[in-house]
Amino acid sequence: AIVFIKQPSSQDALQGRRALLRCEVEAPGPVHVYWLLDGAPVQDTERRFAQGSSLSFAAVDRLQDSGTFQCVARDDVTGEEARSANASFNIKWIEAGPVVLKHPASEAEIQPQTQVTLRCHIDGHPRPTYQWFRDGTPLSDGQSNHTVSSKERNLTLRPAGPEHSGLYSCCAHSAFGQACSSQNFTLSIADESF
């Protein structure tokens, strides 16, 4: 009978970094080993390929490598086929994106004394914590009529005034690393007294 000496196990992995799913098999006859991802055979590429009976990743990809991997062994003489335990990656990643206007719907609708909400489109796993900046200066919660939570990706200005004008950017960090906004947002609010 086919015996798995080493079975693949679920593990943490970093986006773009190396990883290895191990599989070692013993059987009476010569063995063919191949891998399944969500039940479909894994084809070798430069990025992901069989290394002996193990599966090697030159650069883990959160989209292409999400799912359940299984090592499958076939004894060529007896015809027996057996599958290993399931294994998957907990892929840690962070990806930069722009700062966008969430409310109101368009810049034309921004008026003094209205509420303005900006959104930081930096995503990641685990969920990152966010830091906002105006003209390069970090913003902390509760100062100058704005609400910001490091857990939330939104910055709310209520009410918005001329003192809030400036270039808004954000950065986020997680166990994987840090990223800052790829595109920033310039907020211009005219002084009503003029």
């Epitope: 010569p30 027996e80 086929e81």
Partner: antibody, heavy 113, light 111 residues
Framework: QVQMQQSGAELMKPGASVKLSCKAT????????IEWVKQRPGHGLEWIGE????????NSNEKFKGKATFTADTSSNTAYMQLSSLTTEDSAIYYC??????WGQGTLVTVSA | DIVLTQSPASLAVSLGQRATISCRAS??????????MHWYQQKPGQPPKLLIY???NLGSGVPARFSGSGSGTDFSLNIHPVEEDDSAMYFC?????????FGGGSRLEIK
């Protein structure tokens, strides 16, 4: 012990289809590949294809695509191979085998007008 | 497809002597540290019987007079000493790739 019992000889007309059976006993049917091999006098042995009954997954020789279809019934531990659009070239002995070790006795198919 | 060329197509060997059959593959049949090359014996009216698997491993119940060797593309089956009962057809087969392919066969006659 492992045994592969194949169905009896068939005399068929050109253009017809035939379904050969291979009943497996003595092992867990779903976990082993069953292969099919053709033998014609003077043509040696030809590998047609294979099926893993537990999953229904199969592999086949490109040469027999459209000619041979593999199925398996796990309730009766029987594998089947259907041959379609028969011609005299399909006249042969057909073997089923579990891996390389356990072979059926063969089924003779004769195609004649 | 991997093409297997067997030679000779037929041979006649005296009782007690050595019979050697060769099988050459059009490309290597080695993978995972094994040679996926096998040898069968077939007698009239019977299915093929596995003699040697993975180039050099003796099949279950096969006498030690049978031996196999080789790797990559060149393989051979040896029978020594030959016995009367060894009169049969012998086939090599590769199972590294689909489609699995067989050699053309070698007929052994005992003198």
């Amino acid at each position: 012990q492992v045994q592969m019992q194949q169905s009896g000889a068939e005399l068929m007309k050109p253009g017809a289809s035939v379904k050969l059976s291979c009943k497996a006993t003595g092992y867990t049917f779903t976990g082993y590949w069953i292969e099919w091999v053709k033998q014609r006098p003077g043509h040696g042995l030809e590998w047609i294809g294979e099926i893993l009954p537990g999953s229904g997954r199969s592999n086949s020789n490109e040469k027999f695509k459209g000619k041979a279809t593999f199925t398996a019934d796990t309730s009766s531990n029987t594998a089947y191979m259907q041959l379609s659009s028969l011609t005299t070239e399909d006249s042969a002995i057909y073997y089923c085998a579990r891996g390389k070790l356990s072979w059926g006795q063969g089924t003779l198919v004769t195609v004649s007008a | 497809d991997i093409v297997l060329t067997q030679s000779p197509a037929s041979l006649a060997v005296s009782l007690g002597q050595r019979a050697t059959i060769s099988c050459r593959a059009s490309e290597s049949v080695d993978s995972f540290g094994n040679s996926f090359m096998h040898w069968y014996q077939q007698k009239p009216g019977q299915p093929p019987k596995l003699l040697i698997y993975a180039a050099s491993n003796l099949g279950s119940g096969v006498p030690a007079r049978f031996s196999g060797s080789g790797s990559g593309t060149d393989f051979s089956l040896n029978i020594h000493p030959v016995e009367e009962d060894d009169s049969a057809m012998y086939f090599c087969q590769q199972s590294k790739e689909v489609p699995r392919t067989f050699g053309g066969g070698s007929r052994l006659e005992i003198k």
